[in-house]
């Protein structure tokens, strides 16, 4: 009897991109007359269903309608592929395909991992008190949550406060703050993506006299 094989490692996709899954029968077996069901998590959560020689779009979960295409170029050789368009963070999770003939079925399971690379960090000054400079570093549009760090002139980690919010699309916005003295030198803020091993960084140079001392006078009319 044939077996079903799916992706042998997690499928990676960036938010906004298209993902592709392929399942195949081994040994090669014509699947044109079989039922092919791509599902999410559990068998009844239909991502795409092919039955009686045609797609069954009314069986799909609403969030997948209009976003899938079953590629049948190689269905006679037992290879069936699904394209899922415009990936969002909500699509991350376990997927499976179940291929069944009248008397027999097999399935394969794999994971879709979704990532989003956020913006280049923006460093701004939020305060200046007693020659201490308060810095804020902001970056948005990450998934999953990135590792955010301040680093000193020698690349050493600096202790920091961080805040994370999620936007309406489920992406993470990160803020980290830091207080340094005027002669701190080169300070960098970096955000590192957990899965992609990618890092984005911004740097600021804090000079000896960051702000020139000024005598302030009240202007009166």
């Amino acid at each position: 009897q044939w077996q079903v094989f799916g992706p042998d490692k997690p499928v990676q996709a960036l938010v906004g991109e298209d993902a592709a899954f392929s399942c195949f029968l081994s040994p090669k077996t014509n699947a044109e007359a079989m039922e092919v069901r791509f599902f999410r998590g559990q068998f009844s959560s239909v991502v795409h269903l092919y039955r009686d020689g045609k797609d069954q779009p009314f069986m799909q979960m609403p969030q997948y309608q209009g976003r899938t295409k079953l590629v049948k170029d190689s269905i006679a050789e037992g290879r069936i592929s699904l394209r899922l368009e415009n990936i969002t963070v909500l699509d991350a999770g376990l997927y499976g395909c179940r291929i069944s003939s009248q008397s027999y079925y097999q399935k394969a399971i794999w994971e879709l991992q979704v990532s989003a690379l956020g913006s280049v960090p923006l460093i701004s000054i939020t305060g200046y008190v007693d020659r201490d400079i308060q810095l804020l570093c902001q970056s948005s549009g990450w998934f999953p949550r990135p590792t955010a760090k301040w680093k000193g002139p020698q690349g050493q980690d600096l202790s920091t406060d961080s805040r994370t919010n999620r936007d309406m699309h489920g992406l993470f916005d990160v803020e980290i703050s830091l207080t340094v003295q005027e002669n701190a030198g080169s300070i960098s803020c970096s955000m590192r993506h957990a899965h992609l091993s990618r890092e984005v960084e911004s740097r600021v140079q804090i000079g000896d006299t960051f702000f020139e001392p000024i005598s302030w006078h009240l202007a009166t009319k």
């Epitope: 960036l14 592709a20 295409k69 170029d73 269905i75 394209r83």
Partner: antibody, heavy 121, light 106 residues
Framework: EVQLQQSGAEFVRPGASVKMSCTGS????????MHWVKQRPEQGLEWIGR????????KYGPKFQDKATITADTSSNTAYLQLSSLTAEDTAVYYC??????????????WGQGTTLTVSS | QIVLTQSPAIMSASLGEEITLTCSAS?????MHWYQQKSGTSPKLLIY???NLASGVPSRFSGSGSGTFYSLTISSVEAEDAADYYC?????????FGGGTKLEIK
């Protein structure tokens, strides 16, 4: 052998419309998306849009939303590109092209020979 | 939309020379594909999914890159390589092509 055969050259007046065709042989156009790509003289390639011939679902590049209409007739295994309100800017070679799927990734693989459109008064 | 910028726009190379064409994307994409187009013909797939050689393409062609930076290398240029080369992102709508690099043989 897989082939995409496109209709012949067109010479039309500004303001008119034109409809060109792309017929597949050795493949079933329902099995995957069909795309159209524009190439102006001595310039690069621009993706116009695509159709899923199985259900008529289309997507267009932002520049072509109001210019192009892509349709398909599965009984004749043919995809069509209609361009309206033609101007000199639409003078170009138009290619139909077909996705190919290698098991985990997509890329364009089969291309028609191109249809040359000239818009001139 | 993702803008793909190719450089150089025109490259002149001697026979046997190794050359590298680059393609930079305005946002990160998972893969890049490369096409070769000779004068008066349809584009031909050269490299798919960043680094995979399409069927029948000589091994002197190779591709690499990730994120926003991709490249196509020809290890030893031959006369028949004179053509336009386009990078193409097939990751998100609207699909886009680079402006192309014209390779001329000295």
């Amino acid at each position: 052998e897989v082939q995409l055969q496109q209709s012949g050259a067109e010479f039309v007046r500004p303001g008119a419309s034109v409809k060109m065709s792309c017929t597949g042989s050795g493949l079933n156009i329902e099995d995957d998306y069909m795309h159209w790509v524009k190439q102006r003289p001595e310039q690069g390639l621009e993706w116009i849009g695509r159709i899923d011939p199985a259900n008529g679902n289309t997507k267009y590049g932002p520049k072509f939303q109001d210019k192009a209409t892509i349709t398909a007739d599965t009984s004749s295994n043919t995809a069509y590109l209609q361009l309206s309100s033609l101007t000199a800017e639409d003078t170009a070679v138009y290619y139909c092209t077909r996705n190919y799927y290698d098991g985990s990734l997509y890329y364009f693989d089969y291309w028609g020979q191109g249809t040359t459109l000239t818009v001139s008064s | 939309q993702i803008v793909l910028t190719q450089s150089p726009a025109i490259m002149s190379a001697s026979l046997g020379e190794e050359i590298t064409l680059t393609c930079s994307a305005s946002s990160s994409v998972s893969y890049m594909h490369w096409y070769q187009q000779k004068s008066g013909t349809s584009p031909k797939l050269l490299i798919y999914s960043t680094s995979n050689l399409a069927s029948g393409v000589p091994s002197r062609f190779s591709g690499s890159g990730s994120g926003t930076f991709y490249s196509l290398t020809i290890s030893s240029v031959e006369a028949e390589d004179a053509a336009d080369y386009y990078c193409h992102q097939w990751s998100r709508y609207p699909y886009t092509f680079g402006g192309g690099t014209k390779l001329e043989i000295k």
